[in-house]
Interface confidence: medium
């Protein structure tokens, strides 16, 4: 395997571009049990009806890969243990990309993204240990291809869920 | 251990307004969105509003336009103005912390109560 982006890995804020700028995702730093900070984005706006926010990467270079793997984990919240929000609380987001030879696209609009799936929590996860709190690790591995340009940016939308990314990693498989 | 103190509560006419406070301690609870929960007798905790680590805030329809959600990091509080109360606001008030990573609700403050008499 060959690691094109790995979220952990990144120094300092991953800086992605949260739309709308405010009141949507939000990068927020945790601290793993060796107090090293994680980055994650957080979203959690289960109160509100038609939630649309969307969070793109910086460019990923696909370095000639025809195919690609996503590696997501992350955490979403059981909208029963949310009092209160049955009607406006989603289990759900949603994973876009965008082909695109132009490494620093300013502004890319919703419809240009091309829907990759809509991911829910798996019954499986993974406990991992976080400070004084256990969190439920969620997996999720798509891939996208064929792919014709330089490179891709990927997209997170959110419809009314709570939920963290807690790492994201694209690879592909070296023949 | 996360402690959570909510305080304000108290009797009141319909129409009339009360200021609820919550001091939250032993976590860093400005990395989260904090909420006020409210539970009638007889009924089940209902989340009434939030307010995100930057802020915005959210809220459901029996409450919105008449109460705000606000924080003050520095403070470690979480506040929750009322005004324009009605008889069916009648309930204990808690707040706590909306976290997508775990669950917080095994952590509750004693709550604080409301009654509007009409």
């Known amino acids: 395997e060959v690691t094109l982006l790995d979220s952990r890995s990144v120094q300092g804020e991953l800086g992605w571009i949260a739309s709308p700028l405010e009141g949507g995702w939000e990068e927020v730093s945790i601290m793993d049990e060796k107090n090293t900070p994680i980055r994650t984005y957080q979203v959690c706006n289960v109160m509100e009806p038609s939630q649309n926010n969307w969070l793109r990467t910086d460019w990923i270079t696909r370095e000639g890969a025809q195919r690609v793997y996503i590696e997501i984990k992350f955490t979403l919240r059981d909208c029963n243990s949310l009092p209160g929000v049955m009607g406006t609380c989603k289990e759900t987001f949603n994973l876009y990309y965008y082909e695109s030879d132009n490494d620093k696209e300013r502004f890319i609009r919703e419809n240009q993204f091309v829907k990759i799936d809509t991911i829910a929590a798996d019954e499986s996860f993974t406990q991992v240990d976080i400070g004084d709190r256990i969190m439920k690790l969620n997996t999720e591995i798509r891939d996208v291809g064929p792919l014709s340009k330089k490179g891709f940016y990927l997209a997170f939308q959110d419809v009314g869920a709570c939920i963290a990314l807690v790492s994201v990693r694209v690879f592909y498989k070296k023949a | 251990q996360v402690q959570l103190q909510e305080s304000g509560g108290g009797v009141v006419q319909a129409g009339g307004s009360l200021r609820l406070s919550c001091a939250a301690s032993?976590?860093?609870?400005?990395?989260?969105?904090m909420g006020w929960f409210r539970q009638a007798p007889g009924t089940k905790r209902e989340m009434i509003a939030a307010?995100?680590?930057?802020?915005?805030?959210n809220y459901a329809n029996p409450v919105k336009g008449r109460f705000t959600i606000s924080r003050d990091d520095a403070k470690n509080m979480v506040y929750l103005q009322m005004n324009n109360l009605k008889p069916e606001d009648s309930a204990v008030y808690y707040c706590n912390a909306i976290s997508p990573l775990w669950d917080e609700y095994d952590f509750w403050g004693p709550g604080t109560q409301v009654t509007v008499s009409s």
């Open positions: 307010v995100t680590r930057a802020g915005t805030t």
């Open positions: 032993g976590r860093a609870f400005s990395s989260y969105a």
